[in-house]
């Protein structure tokens, strides 16, 4: 869009935002936000929701790919009126229930939820969020928290993943855009390369899988590498190693030549699986090459 | 293959009490949300109740509250729904089915409960 | 909370596309399942999420959900269709689901 960083993870993305009374003087900063963030998502394979939440929950925009409805969805964004109690959990809620949805598909897409709120939550709403973001963690989702203004860090650090999944933003909704650079550096998780792109039919190879955001799992030791052969069979791998811009994991044995081989990486031991356009093909290698 | 099968069900007075049970097979039981939804002769279906996958949540329409109670004991893969109070307009086919997020993807053949004097 | 009205009954010819409607204020932000009903059976869920197909559902089974209206359409329609649909919705935890108040198919 403008030159800045990018993300170009195939995964769904949910935005769950508070429009609750206390944010009605910065919902122009949240939508800002919000915009300018889900124009980095760049990759064709990523989907998009936007929630809001105040005294329920509202999916204002159902998870879609389709850029033209994004637009329409930041459209509607645009025109919030904030307004009542902050219930955060019926924002996991309305996730959660795509997720479920979505799962019962059978193929499970990664799933990535950038929550926002201002202002500290009450015993019981706090407990309900918490509760709730456990439940989208349980159907395979990662959970981002961002904090403004009045926020508690400890009560987000539990309904994120963990402290490193919250972003504070402690001088207030201007200040939102600042963070807008570290929020996609550590939210994005994508597969850029794999190295070599090309193996030889039936014989073992290990391969390198380039990209960023490997290291974000809540536990590294669930990171599989997945290949789905011929758009069909998929084969699961555990890598040999996890760093934060590439895996090291063994090839899957392609007999014939031709073959085709979609990557895959999954962040939580194969629940759900982050997609992408890089492709390992087969080739018919002379003895000696 | 995965299946719902209820009982319990009969003829009660009104302020009367039943408890039906559904027995699951077929999938991992722990893993599912469970509800109860009604439906009373010649009439629409209507929910009743949801618990949660572990039990610890439940839910329940404003119509029952109060009289009815949803358990379930995942060790015997069963689901219950303990109706205090009956009432003539409790007088349904009760369908007990797996759920998730208001989805019911598989449902019981149902059970008939009749409140009469 | 939300309420959902469906049409007491729908006609349609053998073959012939029918298209069973389901309404709500601002229905398009929720989502839609619709199950069929057969005479002295349980219901079958048939779309979940709008428009979704559960495994063993035939294709011509199909739905949508736009601006405050749900649609169950079901094209080349066979006789073994003829049954009360039910559209619903969920509320949330704190209201449950709630479910529309039936259509009954008739093929004629």
């Known amino acids: 869009e403008d030159g800045g960083p990018a993300c170009y993870g195939g995964f769904d993305l949910y935005f769950i935002l508070d429009k609750s009374g206390s944010v009605l003087h910065h919902w122009n900063e949240i939508y800002y936000f919000v915009e300018q963030l889900a124009h980095r998502f760049i990759s064709p394979q990523l989907r998009m929701s936007f929630i809001v939440f105040s005294t329920r929950g509202t999916t204002l925009m159902k998870l879609t790919e389709d850029r033209e409805q994004i637009r329409q969805g930041l459209e509607e964004l645009q025109k919030v009126l904030p307004g009542g109690d902050t219930y955060m959990h019926e924002g996991f809620e309305r996730a959660s229930e795509q997720i479920y949805y979505e799962n019962s598909q059978g193929y499970r897409t990664a799933s990535v939820i950038i929550a926002l709120t201002d202002g500290e939550l009450h015993e019981d709403l706090f407990f309900y969020s918490e509760r709730e973001a456990n439940r989208s963690r349980d159907l395979g989702a990662i959970v981002y928290c961002v904090g403004v203004k009045d926020f508690n860090e400890t009560q987000l650090a539990r309904i994120a993943d963990s402290k490193d999944h919250v972003f504070p933003v402690n001088d207030g909704f201007q200040a939102l855009q600042g963070i807008i650079h570290s929020i996609l550096k550590k939210s994005c998780i994508e597969i850029l390369a794999a190295e070599p792109s090309t193996i030889c039919a039936g014989e073992s190879f290990q391969v390198v899988v380039r990209g960023n955001g490997f290291r974000h799992a809540r536990n590294v030791d669930r990171v599989l590498c997945s290949f789905k052969i011929n758009d069909s069979v998929t084969l699961n791998e555990k890598p040999f190693a996890v760093e934060d811009t590439y895996l090291l994991c063994p090839a899957p044995i392609l007999k014939e030549v031709g073959m085709k081989a979609a990557l895959q990486v999954s962040m939580n031991d194969g629940l759900s699986f982050i997609s992408s356009s890089v492709i390992i093909t087969t080739t018919h290698c002379s003895d000696g090459s | 293959q995965v299946q719902l099968v209820e009982s319990g069900g009969g003829l009660v007075q009104p302020g009367g009490s039943l408890r039906l049970s559904c027995a699951a097979s077929?999938?991992?039981?722990?893993?599912?949300?469970l509800s109860w939804v009604r439906q009373a002769p010649g009439k629409g279906l209507e929910w009743v109740s949801n618990?949660?996958?572990?039990?610890?949540?439940?839910y329940y329409a404003d119509s029952v509250k109060g009289r009815f109670t949803i358990s379930r004991d995942n060790s015997k893969n069963t689901l219950y729904l303990q109706m205090n109070s009956l009432r003539a307009e409790d007088t349904a086919v009760y369908y007990c089915?797996?759920?998730?997020?208001?989805?019911?993807?598989?449902w019981g053949q149902g059970t008939l409960v009749t409140v009469s004097s | 909370d939300i309420e959902l009205t469906q049409p007491p009954s729908v006609s349609v010819a053998p073959g012939q596309t029918a298209r069973i409607s389901c309404s709500g204020d601002k229905l398009r932000e929720y989502y839609v399942h619709w199950y069929q009903q057969k005479p002295g059976q349980a219901p079958v869920l048939v779309i979940y999420?709008?428009?979704k197909r559960p495994s063993g559902i035939p294709e011509r089974f199909s739905g949508s959900n736009s601006g405050n209206t749900a649609t169950l359409t079901i094209s080349g329609t066979q006789a073994e269709d003829e049954a009360d649909y039910y559209c619903?919705?969920?509320?949330?935890?704190?209201?449950?689901?709630?479910f529309g108040g039936g259509t009954k198919l008739t093929v004629l």
């Open positions: 089915a797996r759920a998730g997020y208001g989805l019911f993807d598989v």
């Open positions: 999420g709008d428009n």
């Open positions: 077929g999938f991992t039981f722990n893993s599912y949300g």
């Open positions: 618990i949660s996958s572990n039990g610890s949540y439940t």
């Open positions: 619903s919705s969920w509320a949330g935890s704190r209201s449950g689901t709630v």
